[in-house]
């Protein structure tokens, strides 16, 4: 008789999940020689241990602590770039501006980027059919808890001027329910972080509005100011030109507004 299996509302575990995590770990250590001490088999074992045989709606940050310990990494605390709803441009930026880091430029972020995973209570199986959706099923699912844990730690590590890239094309440029709005903003340490500088990325070619005056940006400024952190905001009117100027800052066209 086939065993009853819980049907969740979200997509199932990404195919080749164990192989992908292990391969990404080895690739990361190949790309980052300073992380060559990491034992990727142990990393996978710790990752697996966080969610295998556990109810996928009952995952805690504690479950991920062994993985967090193995993935401990020092990034320059004053070179952190946070982002919300504009991941691709943030990653393009750190690819060019090599001394700055998004969460996905760290080992743990790189391992899990764009992947989905979950297990089942009391079996060692990975569920490739479906996984809990944050809204429709439960928030304490393996993926959401992972990103909450690593995002909190990443924000806590930040110092001096922290940058955040925000998507100016969205109705809520700053969204309190995003990982940035619900986790990272609240875990920046006022005794270490002097300023949060928001870069609002414009989508439209002819969009010359000052999106730093958007009500949601004002809301972000208010939250940050109440936490005794200074706030500043810049419009990035031409993201393509912005990236080009990061690549070639001496270009004559890069002195004007971007």
């Amino acid at each position: 008789v086939p065993r009853w299996r819980q049907q969740w509302s979200g997509p199932g575990t990404t195919k080749r999940f164990p192989e992908t995590v292990l391969a990404r770990c080895v690739k990361y250590t190949e790309i980052h020689p300073e992380m060559r001490h990491v034992d990727c088999q142990s990393v996978w074992d710790a990752f697996k241990g966080a969610f295998i045989s556990k109810h996928p709606c009952n995952i805690t940050e504690e479950d991920y602590q062994p993985l967090m310990k193995l993935g401990t990494q020092t990034v320059p605390c004053n070179k952190i770039l946070l982002w919300s709803r504009i991941k691709d441009l943030a990653h393009q930026f750190t690819q060019v501006q090599r001394d700055m880091f998004t969460l996905e430029d760290t080992l743990l972020g790189y391992l899990a980027d764009d992947l989905t995973w979950c297990g089942e209570f009391n079996t060692s199986k990975i569920n490739y059919q479906s996984c809990p959706d944050w809204r429709k099923d439960c928030s304490n699912n393996p993926v959401s808890v992972f990103w909450k844990t690593v995002s909190r730690r990443f924000a806590e590590a930040a110092c001096d001027v922290v940058h955040v890239m925000l998507n100016g094309s969205r109705s809520k440029i700053f969204d309190k329910n995003s990982t940035f709005g619900s986790v990272e903003v609240h875990n920046l340490q006022p005794e270490k972080v002097q300023t949060l500088e928001a870069w609002v990325i414009h989508g439209g070619r002819e969009d010359s509005r000052d999106l730093c005056q958007d009500p949601t940006i004002k809301e972000l400024e208010s939250i940050i100011s109440k936490r005794n952190i200074q706030f500043s905001c810049k419009n990035i009117y031409r993201p393509d030109k912005f990236l080009q100027c990061v690549k070639n800052p001496e270009d004559s066209s890069c002195t004007s507004e971007i």
């Epitope: 080749r16 192989e19 391969a23 990404r24 690739k27 020689p33 060559r36 690819q95």
Partner: antibody, heavy 120, light 107 residues
């Protein structure tokens, strides 16, 4: 088995560009970093850079920065290396290479090489 | 960049000889070193990785030793197929760098 098959020999004029391809088979293309190495006639080996096929991230040797671009097409499991503003000292055999994950980070697999001749 | 210096640049030997090639790194590279064999018109072939581990399919007459800055490749009893050029390579740090090569020729 793992195979890296490169495109054929090229003859280019100084100032031109060349694009060498490297088609991978026998493994999951996105699971491994691809490196490029070149060897001028009668000379030693020179590492040029790497690309992560999964994300398109790259890192290039300082001396080639601005002239080299490495790309991949994951749908065909092919890596490309483009070199621009060619000079006579770019005449070399160009190799793609990858590690085996079980052999440290030495290059266990190599393409057969592509001879690029730069001559006016 | 880390400089890799190989010696000798040419080595004449006979079948059955024991030969040693040395590679020196300009800074500590721990055991992050590979040795390759290359024959004319062919791609290099990995012989040794992590300074002393034998790659798959490589005859046991090849061995590597050393760590830090001094490394050696030893062929215990030369075979006719072993006459080729040998390169060391460090993969401790980017940019990866190779030694200038040692050409092993028949005496």
């Amino acid at each position: 088995q793992v195979q890296l098959v490169q495109s054929g020999a090229e003859v280019k004029k100084p100032g031109a560009s060349v694009k060498v391809s490297c088609k991978a088979s026998g493994y999951t293309f996105t699971d491994y970093i691809m490196h490029w190495v070149r060897q001028a006639p009668g000379q030693g080996l020179e590492w040029m850079g790497w690309i992560d096929p999964e994300y398109g991230r790259t890192d290039y040797a300082q001396k080639l920065q601005g002239r080299v671009t490495m790309t991949t097409d994951t749908s065909t499991s092919t890596a490309y290396m483009e070199l621009r503003s060619l000079r006579s000292d770019d005449t070399a055999v160009y190799y793609c290479a990858r590690s085996a994950h079980t052999t440290g980070f030495g290059f266990a697999y190599w393409g057969q090489g592509t001879l690029v001749t730069v001559s006016s | 960049d880390i400089q890799m210096t190989q010696s000798p640049s040419t080595l004449s030997a006979s079948v059955g000889d024991r030969v040693t090639i040395t590679c020196r790194a300009s800074e500590d590279i721990y055991s992050n070193l590979a040795w390759y064999q290359q024959k004319p018109g062919k791609a290099p072939k990995l012989l040794i990785y992590d300074a002393n581990s034998l790659a798959d399919g490589v005859p046991s007459r090849f061995s590597g030793s050393g760590s830090g800055t001094e490394f050696t490749l030893t062929i215990s009893s030369l075979q006719p197929d072993d006459f080729a050029t040998y390169y060391c390579q460090q993969y401790n740090n980017y940019p990866y760098t190779f030694g200038q090569g040692t050409k092993l020729e028949i005496k």
